[in-house]
Amino acid sequence: EINGSANYEMFIFHNGGVQILCKYPDIVQQFKMQLLKGGQILCDLTKTKGSGNTVSIKSLKFCHSQLSNNSVSFFLYNLDHSHANYYFCNLSIFDPPPFKVTLTGGYLHIYESQLCCQLK
């Protein structure tokens, strides 16, 4: 299911890097979140629960990430103009059932003021 543009601020710039915010409903207990740049998988994070409600977090394509009860943040550093692109949060929900996939995204504009190492 493609939902189109994120209806929240998806990109937060700081210190020459960007935090890409991927939100999900807090009812969701087990999921996989992928960050796509165009059609390429940049990062992923999978949260599962085992017996006794033990939480497991796994990444096949590791990026610096941060998990809260309703979002995953992926951090990209050393921004340059090549980072400008469409980015998508690809959420696969395992629990609660049924399995659902939803895609939200936006375009990352890179301005000179956001670059990490500007030439003086």
């Epitope: 939902n3 994120a6 999900y24 409903p25 009812i27 969701v28 609660p96 049924p98 399995f99 659902k100």
Partner: antibody, heavy 125, light 108 residues
Framework: EVRLVESGGGLVQSGGSLRLSCAAS????????MHWVRQVTGKGLEWVSA???????YYSDSVKGRFTISREDARNSLYLQMSSLRAGDTAVYYC???????????????????WGQGTTVTVAS | EVVLTQFPATLSLSPGERATLSCRAS??????LAWFQQKPGQAPRLLIY???NRATGIPARFSGSGSGTDFTLTISSLEPEDFAVYYC??????????FGPGTRLEIK
Amino acid sequence: EVRLVESGGGLVQSGGSLRLSCAASEFIFNSYDMHWVRQVTGKGLEWVSAIGTAGDTYYSDSVKGRFTISREDARNSLYLQMSSLRAGDTAVYYCTGDRTVVRGVNYYYYGMDVWGQGTTVTVAS
Amino acid sequence: EVVLTQFPATLSLSPGERATLSCRASQNIRSYLAWFQQKPGQAPRLLIYGASNRATGIPARFSGSGSGTDFTLTISSLEPEDFAVYYCQQRISWPPITFGPGTRLEIK
């Protein structure tokens, strides 16, 4: 008019098999998660099985390993293959559909808003 | 498994009266509760989803409330066609999807 029409019910001996079908019309079948719910005469509703839009399947403990749910979106059809039938499986079987929509932080569940008229399965012991 | 309990089991009222039906869940299901009406020989009909949202075509006299574990279906002024069996149902903690045992609303 939105319609679900079940068929395939009937009388079968204990240990036998039946295949129930449900034909959908006038709604976007492939956007619905589909379920089978049964009801023994004079009793309450019991959920049996479900299949998601992605083909993921779910079963109640009482039918797991004996029943198989499937869907054919191109034909707007839902199926329930029932085997190793028992007297306790005797009931009216309804097919029904519901929708879940995820948008950002919102998780919307719209309820089982389409139902068939039911088909009767009788298992003779 | 989430167990749903409905009470009363039977409710005897007259047309024009207000009906209050209750459903209690064994654990927190937030607002993911639906109400159904079923008449003899017919399939169930969705009345309320998300605890308080009326389904398409359902008259305004039907309303739902509650969240967490305690839910209520209210029929503000009973019409003759409202006498039936009412079920609550949850589908957030599953499988299995569970239904309550039902409340029979009968004419006094």
